[in-house]
C-alpha cells in the first residue's frame, strides 16, 4: 500500500489528523461485574481520493484511502469477578490497550499485536 | 453500513469534506494518440475511528471508516485516433465521468456503475 498522505498540494491548508483520545471503557461479561478501565480510542480525518477509471484500464485504478486506526496496541488481561458463578468465580478478558494511532491504508488490518 | 459521519461531538470544530475537483485527464491506448478531456476527481477528509476491541468480544467491533469516492458517475465513449493501425484506425475507450462525490463507507464499492 502507498504511504499515508499527510498533506495535499491542492489543499495546502488541510492536514490529515488521527488522535488517540483517552476514554473510559466498560469491560463486561455475562454474569460478571463490569469493570471500568482507562483506555484510548483512535479518531481522525485522513485523506482519501478517487481518480476516474477507464475501460480498458490504462493504469492501476487511482484510488487512495487512509483510515485512522491503531498503530500500536497491546493486549492486557482484565479479570472480572463473577459472584453468581460458583464454578467460575472469575473470568479473564483480553482488552486491547491502544498506545497510539495513525492514518493507515483502509484495507490494512489494524496492528492488533496478538489477535 | 452506518450512514457517513459529517460531525463529531468530540470535535465540534471539525467537519468531514469530500469535493469533486476539476481535472484534465489524459486518455490513452497502446498505438493511439492520447486525448485530454475535462473530468473530475474526488478528494477529501472523511471521519474514521476505532474503539478498542476485547476478547471475547462483548459487542460488535466499534470501527468506522468513511472514504471520499464517486457518489454519481456515468461512462462515456472517448474515441482515439490510431494512425499506426490500419486494421483498427480508431479505438473507443470508456471513461468514467464523475458527477459528484461524497463520504461513503470504506468497504463500499464506489458507484463505478459498470466496472
Amino acid at each position: 500500500a502507498p504511504p499515508p498522505i499527510n498533506k495535499l498540494a491542492l489543499f495546502p491548508d488541510k492536514s490529515a489528523w488521527c488522535e488517540a483520545k483517552n476514554i473510559t471503557q466498560i469491560v463486561g461479561h455475562s454474569g460478571c461485574e463490569a469493570k471500568s478501565i482507562q483506555n484510548r480510542a483512535c479518531l481522525g480525518q485522513c485523506f482519501s481520493y478517487s481518480v476516474p477509471n477507464t475501460f480498458p484500464q490504462s493504469t492501476e485504478s487511482l484510488v487512495h484511502c487512509d483510515s485512522c486506526m491503531p498503530a500500536q496496541s497491546m493486549w492486557e488481561i482484565v479479570t472480572l469477578e463473577c459472584p453468581g458463578h460458583e464454578e467460575v468465580p472469575r473470568v479473564d478478558k483480553l482488552v486491547e490497550k491502544i498506545v497510539h494511532c495513525s492514518c493507515q491504508a483502509c484495507g490494512k488490518e489494524p496492528s492488533h499485536e496478538g489477535l | 453500513a452506518p450512514p457517513p459521519i459529517n460531525k463529531l461531538a468530540l470535535f465540534p470544530d471539525k467537519s468531514a469534506w469530500c469535493e469533486a475537483k476539476n481535472i484534465t485527464q489524459i486518455v490513452g491506448h497502446s498505438g493511439c494518440e492520447a486525448k485530454s478531456i475535462q473530468n473530475r476527481a474526488c478528494l477529501g477528509q472523511c471521519f474514521s475511528y476505532s474503539v478498542p476491541n476485547t476478547f471475547p468480544q462483548s459487542t460488535e467491533s466499534l470501527v468506522h471508516c468513511d472514504s471520499c469516492m464517486p457518489a454519481q458517475s456515468m461512462w462515456e465513449i472517448v474515441t482515439l485516433e490510431c494512425p499506426g493501425h490500419e486494421e483498427v484506425p480508431r479505438v473507443d475507450k470508456l471513461v468514467e465521468k464523475i458527477v459528484h462525490c461524497s463520504c461513503q463507507a470504506c468497504g463500499k464499492e464506489p458507484s463505478h456503475e459498470g466496472l
Partner: antibody, heavy 120, light 111 residues
Framework: EVQLLESGPGLVKPSQTLSLTCTVS??????????WSWIRQHPGKGLEWIGY???????YYNPSLKSRVTISVDTSKNQFSLKLSSVTAADTAVYYC????????????WGQGTLVTVSS | QSVLTQPPSVSAAPGQKVTISCSGS????????VSWYQQLPGTAPKLLTY???KRPSGIPDRFSGSKSGTSATLGITGLQTGDEADYYC????????????FGGGTKVTVL
C-alpha cells in the same frame, strides 16, 4: 475470419451458478482493439448486453447484472468465460458471445448462441 | 422495457421499401453512434450497419442507416423474401446505468 463458439451446460438449477465458455478461432483474443462480449436473449424477446472484457482482463459489466456477473479471459486457450451466480428462471435465455470491434457500439462477430434453461 | 424504442412490426410487398425507426435520448443515440443488426429466424444476429451509416463488407447497399438527433432509421429497399427477420438497433448509453443498449426489435414481414 474470426469464429466464436459457446459451450457449457444447457440446464442449470435455480440458485446455482451458470458457467459458459467462448472459444475463439481464426484470430487471437490478445490482439488489441477488440472487446469481447456476452449478450443474452430471453425466449421470444430482445437482446440484453451482459458485459465486456479486454484481453488484459479489464472488465465492464451491465450495471443491472453487475452484482452477479464475472467475465474472465484465458489468453493461452484463446477463450473467455461468463459466470452468472444465483440464477433464477428469469435467466433462461440464449447466451451469445461476441467480438465488439474497437468501436464499442459495433458488435461485428457473434457466436451461434447456446440455450441455457434454469429449472429444478 | 427497452431503452431504445422500435415499432414491433413493419411489412411491405417484395421490391418495396421499408423503414424502421429507433428512438432514444441524448444520453444514447443523441451522443453516440448507432448500429443495426439483422436476426434471421433461429440464427444469431448479424451486423448490418455501424457508425450510423456505414456497412460492413458483404452487406448489400439495399440496407442503409441514418441518424438525426435522438432517432435513427434503417432503410431496406428492393425488399426480398430473405429479408424477413427481426431487426435491432443498438448504441451506447452514458446515463447513470451506462451500458450497451438495444431496441426491442422490429419484425419485418414480406407480404
Amino acid at each position: 475470419e474470426v469464429q466464436l463458439l459457446e459451450s457449457g451446460p444447457g440446464l442449470v438449477k435455480p440458485s446455482q451458478t451458470l458457467s459458459l465458455t467462448c472459444t475463439v478461432s481464426g484470430g487471437s483474443i490478445s490482439s488489441g482493439g477488440y472487446y469481447w462480449s456476452w449478450i443474452r436473449q430471453h425466449p421470444g424477446k430482445g437482446l440484453e448486453w451482459i458485459g465486456y472484457i479486454y484481453y488484459s482482463g479489464s472488465t465492464y459489466y451491465n450495471p443491472s447484472l453487475k452484482s452477479r456477473v464475472t467475465i474472465s479471459v484465458d489468453t493461452s486457450k484463446n477463450q473467455f468465460s461468463l459466470k452468472l451466480s444465483s440464477v433464477t428462471a428469469a435467466d433462461t435465455a440464449v447466451y451469445y458471445c461476441a467480438r465488439t470491434n474497437s468501436r464499442i457500439t459495433m458488435i461485428a462477430d457473434w457466436g451461434q448462441g447456446t440455450l441455457v434453461t434454469v429449472s429444478s | 422495457q427497452s431503452v431504445l424504442t422500435q415499432p414491433p412490426s413493419v411489412s411491405a410487398a417484395p421490391g418495396q421499401k421499408v423503414t424502421i425507426s429507433c428512438s432514444g435520448s441524448s444520453s444514447n443515440i443523441g451522443n453516440n453512434y448507432v448500429s443495426w443488426y439483422q436476426q434471421l429466424p433461429g440464427t444469431a444476429p448479424k451486423l448490418l450497419t455501424y457508425d450510423n451509416n456505414k456497412r460492413p463488407s458483404g452487406i448489400p447497399d439495399r440496407f442503409s442507416g441514418s441518424k438525426s438527433g435522438t432517432s435513427a432509421t434503417l432503410g431496406i429497399t428492393g425488399l426480398q423474401t430473405g429479408d424477413e427477420a427481426d431487426y435491432y438497433c443498438g448504441t451506447w448509453d452514458s446515463s447513470l446505468s451506462a451500458g450497451h443498449v438495444f431496441g426491442g426489435g422490429t419484425k419485418v414481414t414480406v407480404l
